[in-house]
């Protein structure tokens, strides 16, 4: 007889999830021979720790605390680039700018990106079918409080002036309920951060409006003052333009506005 | 069952060039790095260098660099390397390897043999 | 580069027979990080790509017979077949897996009478 099985409203763990997360992590501490002594069947054994055998609703940042020991990695703290949906930008950003890095530039953040995944409570099982999802189920689930964790810890790090790409295109420039705005945001420390820099990407070419003037960034720039931590924003007008001239900088046409 | 199947092998004449193609089963070349090593006649394994067919990033021996280009076409699942400017020097068996989710080189291609001869 | 040095370059053996080989590097492939020397030794038959033997210089791969035992520490590695089969026939490399450019050792050519 088949064992009932909580259907959740997302998307089922990632195929191939196992072999994904242990060929990503020996991949990673190839290019990055600062992390070849770390011992990727143990990060694996550890992340699977983390959510096998317990119930998805039920997920806790200390769940996550054997992965994060494992996976612990010093990255230059004034060289930290926060994104908020504008992923894909952000990571061409420091493919160029190598000495940039965000969250999925880490180990912990590549182990992950973009994949899903959830257990089943008591069975050593992966579900494959479905996974809860944040709004739908329930906030505590394995994907949701990995990046709640990484994401703090990331935040945590970072010192001097901290860069966030933030997205121009949306009705909410800054959105409070994103990672950066309900994570990162609150947890940089500012008897180490000076400034957080806000570069807002414009999506229109013809859009030539100063988006910093936008009032979800004005709420940024309070939230950011209140903390002791200076804010500056400049806009993005050609996101196309700014990753040239980032690979090309000493072309003529990069000295003007991007 | 992971696997890399190569293309076959290449009779060449000196100063030209050439591209050897790698072909990846069982899993997807975007999870790990692809790297070439060289082995000339009675002689030792050369490692050549390795591209990440994520971002095309590559990696080569300092010896290869004027030599060798690697590419990718994750689409394909392939990998590439072109030799140029051919001499009987380059005259071997290339291998493309991968270690996929082992520490270590686990799996080779069955290797191209390369002959460059006028 | 770290130069990878392999002694004998050949030897022959009788089978049943106990075989060692050497391999010295110029370098040391110890990582302080984690104690784990980054040296593999690899087993090529005539006409085949290398098989994986041993990596972090003592850990035999799974299916590796275990009259196959590697050894060692920092730039000297020793591999040893307790009891030569006749299959063993082969060409023996070791390869520096600690730096960049992975360097491999000339070899060792052993031979069955």
């Known amino acids: 007889v088949p064992r009932w099985r909580q259907q959740w409203s997302g998307p089922g763990t990632t195929k191939r999830f196992p072999e994904t997360v242990l060929a990503r992590c020996v991949k990673y501490t190839e290019i990055h021979p600062e992390m070849r002594h770390v011992d990727c069947q143990s990060v694996w054994d550890a992340f699977k720790g983390a959510f096998i055998s317990k119930h998805p609703c039920n997920i806790t940042e200390e769940d996550y605390q054997p992965l994060m020991k494992l996976g612990t990695q010093t990255v230059p703290c004034n060289k930290i680039l926060l994104w908020s949906r504008i992923k894909d930008l952000a990571h061409q950003f420091t493919q160029v700018q190598r000495d940039m890095f965000t969250l999925e530039d880490t180990l912990l953040g590549y182990l992950a990106d973009d994949l899903t995944w959830c257990g089943e409570f008591n069975t050593s099982k992966i579900n494959y079918q479905s996974c809860p999802d944040w709004r739908k189920d329930c906030s505590n689930n394995p994907v949701s409080v990995f990046w709640k964790t990484v994401s703090r810890r990331f935040a945590e790090a970072a010192c001097d002036v901290v860069h966030v790409m933030l997205n121009g295109s949306r009705s909410k420039i800054f959105d409070k309920n994103s990672t950066f705005g309900s994570v990162e945001v609150h947890n940089l420390q500012p008897e180490k951060v000076q400034t957080l820099e806000a570069w807002v990407i414009h999506g229109g070419r013809e859009d030539s409006r100063d988006l910093c003037q936008d009032p979800t960034i004005k709420e940024l720039e309070s939230i950011i003052s209140k903390r002791n931590i200076q804010f500056s924003c400049k806009n993005i007008y050609r996101p196309d333009k700014f990753l040239q001239c980032v690979k090309n900088p000493e072309d003529s046409s990069c000295t003007s506005e991007i | 069952e992971v696997q890399l199947q190569q293309s076959g092998a290449e009779l060449v004449r000196p100063g030209a060039s050439v591209k050897l193609s790698c072909t990846a089963s069982?899993?997807?070349?975007?999870?790990?790095?692809i790297h070439w090593v060289k082995q000339r006649p009675e002689q030792g394994l050369e490692w050549i260098g390795w591209?990440?067919?994520?971002?095309?990033?590559?990696k080569y021996a300092p010896k290869f660099q004027d030599k060798a280009t690697l590419t990718a076409d994750t689409s394909s699942n392939t990998a590439y390397l072109q030799l140029s400017t051919l001499t009987s020097e380059d005259t071997a068996i290339y291998y493309c390897?991968?270690?996929?989710?082992?520490?270590?080189?686990?799996?080779w291609g069955q290797g191209t043999t390369l002959t460059v001869s006028s | 580069d770290i130069v990878m040095t392999q002694s004998p370059s050949s030897l022959t053996v009788t089978a049943g027979e106990k075989v060692t080989m050497s391999c010295k590097s110029s370098?040391?492939?110890?990582?302080?990080?984690?104690?784990?020397?980054?040296l593999t030794w690899y087993q090529q038959k005539p006409g085949q790509p290398p098989k994986l033997l041993i990596y972090?210089?003592?850990t035999r791969e799974s299916g590796v017979p275990d009259r196959f035992t590697g050894s060692g520490s920092g730039t000297d590695f020793t591999l040893t077949i307790s009891s030569v089969q006749a299959e063993d026939l082969a060409v023996y490399y070791c390869?520096?897996?600690?730096?960049?450019?992975?360097?491999f050792g000339g070899g060792t050519k052993l031979e069955i009478k």
């Open positions: 390897v991968s270690r996929y989710i082992n520490y270590y080189f686990a799996y």
């Open positions: 972090w210089a003592s």
């Open positions: 390869q520096n897996d600690y730096d960049y450019p992975y360097t």
């Open positions: 591209i990440d067919p994520e971002d095309d990033k590559t």
């Open positions: 370098q040391s492939l110890l990582h302080s990080g984690n104690q784990r020397n980054y």
């Open positions: 069982g899993f997807n070349i975007k999870d790990s790095l």
